[in-house]
Interface confidence: medium
């Protein structure tokens, strides 16, 4: 029979043969042959694989470094990574929560509505039309767009919530 060019779901093609992928939580030890099944082994302690795979090494669980203000929110399993969160009163710098800050910053396009206090975090608000913020800051409010008219200039490029307008000279009509 013709060797396969594609395999079913949860299989992979190797040496013109379809082998079963290893299930989540297990790594590949050896590919299948004409006579044997794919050989898989469970991931070790503090390791995981979260997909059907042909990986020869499991991934290490994330380390929630207390020196970065992190603590374990959910312990990892052989099929899932550890989920970190920040200590009380601190906030993740990103969705992945790789480090923590005392107060959250407002991203570009957002301004500070209220600065953080001892009991509440920074409150951000989207910059409305006519205002912008091009920085990530725990203190910067949305800035108003530059008024080109007051400088006797015209708008060459419209502003956005992240950028100021660009002003330029007025076109002079030639006689």
């Amino acid at each position: 029979p013709e060797p396969p060019t594609a395999c079913r779901e949860k299989q992979y093609l190797i040496n013109s043969q379809c082998c079963s992928l290893c299930q989540p939580g297990q790594k590949l030890v050896s590919d299948c042959t004409e006579f044997t099944e794919t050989e898989c082994l469970p991931c070790g302690e503090s390791e995981f694989l979260d997909t059907w795979n042909r990986e020869t090494h499991c991934h290490q669980h994330k380390y929630c470094d207390p020196n970065l203000g992190l603590r374990v929110q959910q312990k990892g399993t052989s099929e899932t990574d550890t989920i970190c969160t920040c200590e009380e009163g601190w906030h993740c710098t990103s969705e992945a929560c790789e480090s923590c800050v005392l107060h959250r910053s407002c991203s570009p396009g957002f301004g500070v509505k209220q600065i953080a206090t001892g009991v509440s975090d920074t409150i951000c608000e989207p910059c409305p039309v006519g205002f912008f913020s091009n920085v990530s800051s725990a203190f910067e409010k949305c800035h108003p767009w530059t008024s080109c008219e007051t400088k006797d200039l015209v708008v060459q490029q419209a502003g956005t919530n992240k950028t100021d307008v660009v002003c330029g000279p007025q076109d002079r009509l030639r006689a």
Epitope: C100, V101, L102, H103, S137, F139, E140, K141
Partner: nanobody, 118 residues
Framework: EVQLLESGGGLVQPGGSLRLSCAAS????????MEWARQAPGKGLEWVST????????YYADSVKGRFTISRDNSKNTLYLQMNSLRAEDTAVYYC???????????WGQGTLVTVSS
């Protein structure tokens, strides 16, 4: 090495004015929020005012609102506090500090003493 050097303190009569300065070096001043805080004799540290990186956004404690103005000159790496209508209760050592996104305000200057007395 981060350095913050306050100056401009002194003895002033109630109702008078003073302008404090804080010369900064050793970090990117224009990218760093700054603040003034004060410590009255025998009291804890009290937040006075904060200014954003650009100088556009300013924040004040209720006790100084309308009387004090924080400002900065990023070209000179200098922070200012203009203090008007001074009262006896404004007597304190005034400190400037730089913001650190991980630890809050760190690196304090040595302070400058402001005494409001007749």
């Amino acid at each position: 090495e981060v350095q913050l050097l306050e100056s401009g303190g002194g003895l002033v009569q109630p109702g008078g004015s003073l302008r404090l300065s804080c010369a900064a070096s050793g970090f990117t001043f224009s990218a760093t929020p700054m603040e003034w805080a004060r410590q009255a004799p025998g009291k804890g540290l009290e937040w006075v005012s904060t200014i954003s990186e650009s100088g556009y956004s300013t924040y004040y404690a209720d006790s100084v609102k309308g009387r004090f103005t924080i400002s900065r000159d990023n070209s000179k790496n200098t922070l200012y506090l203009q203090m008007n209508s001074l009262r006896a209760e404004d007597t304190a050592v005034y400190y400037c500090a730089k913001w650190n996104s991980t630890t809050g305000f760190d690196y304090w200057g040595q302070g400058t003493l402001v005494t409001v007395s007749s």
